[in-house]
């Protein structure tokens, strides 16, 4: 399918002008190639009428032009002084006329209505309000005022000053007669319907002295705003319906093949399951305006969308609406990234988030989509490092690999972490993407101890066990903070407080702190990566305590207060009937450090890797 997009149908009246906007993917080639507007003939050929290279056909001379807007990926064709002969089938496109990079546009130019002299024309959008002004002479001031609608040769009474209201206008029309001295009455019609369209007649008095005034009411369906967005990207529909419906339920719906409108989301809590996890209805402003954001755009999201207001939260005739025609461009600049990421309980996930590579300095965010009511997405982490408290020690946003992608790591997974998350920046909103985290059966691949307690001044050595499949990966330990996870520098950086010395074929990588200081307390992550692409992680919390008095720490295996089948153990692991119940934080992410000799003074932190004959259980 062609990635060029424009209005399918354009209608106007003789003598008027039209402006037709066509969209194209703003690649370097497309921005600079020829743009054209051509008319399809009976033979199927398309004859150029105007192009971006300056050509204008004789038929269009002096009344048409084509302007390219390469920075937006659009071009606009303006045609003035329309005649009935301009009705027909056209194409807007790129390159050569027959190549297929085009969009079909139907133009219909109709004859303007033959209106009686002195007819006032009122042009109003469906659902809105019109006020028809009806002047009269002093002598008709005390007489009956009325509004009729002309249908063919007959006139149907709509409303009069004797309290008659035509049933078709019930509860939405009123006739106002001003105080003395003002020789004008008004008829106000609310919530206009398409069927209200037509010629009306104001009348004051009767007989030959009556006052009459013709009014032509044109009720327009809102012209759909064309919206051109990339596959996998995001779209925002801004809906401003006016103060008169500020306190009425709002909705967004999509027009289906039967020309009815299926609710996508509304403020009454309804949401189409096809948009689960990727839609938000943002709170209304005081003026009743609101917006709907849809991320992770799919080709099947294309179509005509309407937003509106009605107490039922769905489309009803005569209520204000706004319209959009959404086109999803498959030649997307947004890279493919997994829409579902799977992790195991106790394990971790590393999520790749795309952003506009032109905005490398933008702030990056990650939020959790919550479906309740209209949906919300509270931020969990941002590139400046702020993390929601309940994610402390298990969530980090990394700028790597960069160049249009950042990484979010979440570990110590539980079933409650399953759900939809959004990647976003404070820059281009079209690059918002959605990822679903699913928690599946299995064991974490990286194994670290549960709660670890270090003693001030002593050596601490924590192992991280990994399966053979990670032998080709780079292993690391890092110390977590709310601004990221600081990897320990490698050995070739010279003497330092921390160094890495990891045998690449090993299946055990260890963190050594020697001697332990107060500053060592906190979360450590053990992880694997390939270049700038992060894999699994496991986290361990290291608590630091003062040296205990000798002999006060240990519990005898035969201690009387332990149940006969239960041993009280030292690290948060209870052993009952020979079954170890691991502390839920047994698996966590960490940084890698190297082993030093017996009671060595040497470097304070190091990483070591050593081979292991058995490999830990693997979930994959």
């Amino acid at each position: 399918k062609s990635p060029v997009f424009g209005p399918q149908e354009v209608s106007s009246v003789e003598g008027n002008s039209v402006s037709i906007k066509c969209y194209y993917p703003p690649t370097s080639v497309n921005r600079h190639t020829r743009k054209y507007w051509c008319r399809k003939g009976a033979s199927g050929r398309c004859i150029t009428l105007v192009s971006s290279e300056g050509y204008v056909s004789s038929n269009y001379a002096g009344r048409a032009n084509l302007t390219n807007f390469p920075e937006n990926g659009t071009f606009v064709v303006n045609i003035a002084q329309l005649s009935r002969d301009d009705s027909g089938h056209y194409k807007c496109g790129l390159g050569i006329n027959s190549r297929g990079l085009s969009f079909d546009v139907s133009l219909e130019v109709s004859q303007g209505p033959e209106l009686p002299n002195g007819t006032e024309v009122y042009t109003v959008d469906v659902g809105r309000t019109v006020t028809i002004k009806c002047p009269f002479k002093t002598e008709n001031a005390p007489k009956t005022k009325a509004l009729y609608k002309k249908i063919g040769q007959t006139s149907v009474l709509v409303i009069d000053s004797r309290n008659y209201v035509n049933p078709n206008y019930k509860d939405r029309i009123r006739l106002r007669i001003p105080g003395t001295g003002q020789l004008i009455f008004t008829v106000v019609i609310d919530r206009l319907r398409l069927s209200d369209h037509g010629l009306y007649l104001c009348q004051a008095g009767d007989g030959s002295n009556r006052d009459e005034k013709n009014a032509d009411l044109q009720v327009l369906e809102p012209e759909p705003e064309l919206v051109y967005e990339d596959l996998r990207g995001s779209v925002t529909f801004h809906c401003a319906l006016g103060l008169e419906v500020a306190n009425v339920a709002k909705f967004l719906c999509r027009v289906n093949s039967r020309e009815t409108c299926d609710v996508v989301i509304n403020t009454l809590g309804k949401r189409d399951s096809a948009f689960e996890g990727r839609i938000l209805l943002n709170p209304q402003d005081k003026d009743g305006s609101f917006s709907v954001v849809i991320t992770g755009l799919r080709k099947e999201d294309e179509g005509r969308y309407l937003c509106g207001a009605h107490s039922d939260g769905q489309l009803q005739e005569g209520w204000p609406i706004q319209a959009w025609q959404l086109f999803v461009n498959e030649e997307s600049t947004i890279p493919r990234s997994p829409t579902v990421v799977k992790g195991v309980a106790g394990g971790s996930v590393a999520v790749l988030c795309p952003y506009n590579p032109k905005e490398s300095q933008s702030l990056k965010y990650w939020c959790l989509w919550e479906g309740a009511q209209n949906g919300r997405c509270p931020l969990l982490v941002e590139s400046q490092g702020l993390v929601q408290e309940q994610y402390e020690g298990r969530l980090s946003l990394l700028q790597e690999p960069g160049n249009g992608t950042f990484t979010v790591i979440l570990n110590q997974l539980t079933t409650q972490d399953a759900g939809f998350y959004w990647c976003l920046t404070n820059g281009d909103t079209r690059w918002r993407t959605t990822v679903e985290i699913k928690i599946i059966e299995g064991e974490p691949n990286l194994k670290v101890p549960g709660n670890v307690t270090a003693v001030l001044g002593e050596t601490l050595n924590i192992p991280c066990h990994f399966p053979c499949k990670f032998s080709s990966y780079e292993k690391y330990w890092c110390k977590w903070s709310n601004t990221g996870c600081q990897t320990l520098p490698s050995q070739d950086e010279g003497p330092s407080e921390a160094f890495v010395n990891c045998d690449e074929n090993s299946r055990l990588v260890s963190l050594t702190l020697n001697p332990v200081t107060r500053a060592d307390e906190g979360w450590y992550w053990c992880g694997v990566k390939q270049g700038h692409f992060y894999g699994e992680t496991a986290a361990v919390y290291v608590a630091v305590e003062e040296k205990k008095v000798a002999g006060s720490r240990y519990v005898s295996p035969a201690k009387a207060d332990a149940a006969p089948d239960e041993k009280v153990l030292d690290s948060g692991v209870r052993e009952i009937e020979n079954k170890a119940i691991q502390d839920p934080r047994l698996f966590a992410e960490e940084k890698v450090v190297a082993d030093t000799g017996d009671q060595a003074g040497g470097s304070r932190a190091s990483v070591d890797s050593s081979s292991s004959e058995e490999q830990g259980g693997s979930s994959k």
Partner: nanobody, 125 residues
Amino acid sequence: QVQLVESGGGLVQAGDSLRLSCAASGRTLSFDTYAMGWFRQAPGKEREFVASIDWSGGTTYYADSVKGRFTVTRDNAKNTVTLRMNSLKPADTAVYYCAAAQYYRSGTSFPANYWGQGTLVTVSS
């Protein structure tokens, strides 16, 4: 999880040597993932730390009372840890326990997760 079985205890004369072994079995993680330690408990006394060794064998730590006399080693291929005791004294008489930990901590506060049943060492004068 890990099962630990000690062996090698017995009655010896003061000044003699003895070698205790601890065999580990179980498939939670491989043996060389665990730091190993030795403890002892004399009749009527608290259990006390004797020695520890990290999973690679590169780091060891001893209680002051045994430093220079006892040596701890491990053979990861055979899933065993050994405590070589020289110049034994009557004060060394105790039940000796082998322990395994998920991480290594130097000092006398070895973070044991798993314990053996113990083997008795008696040193007569």
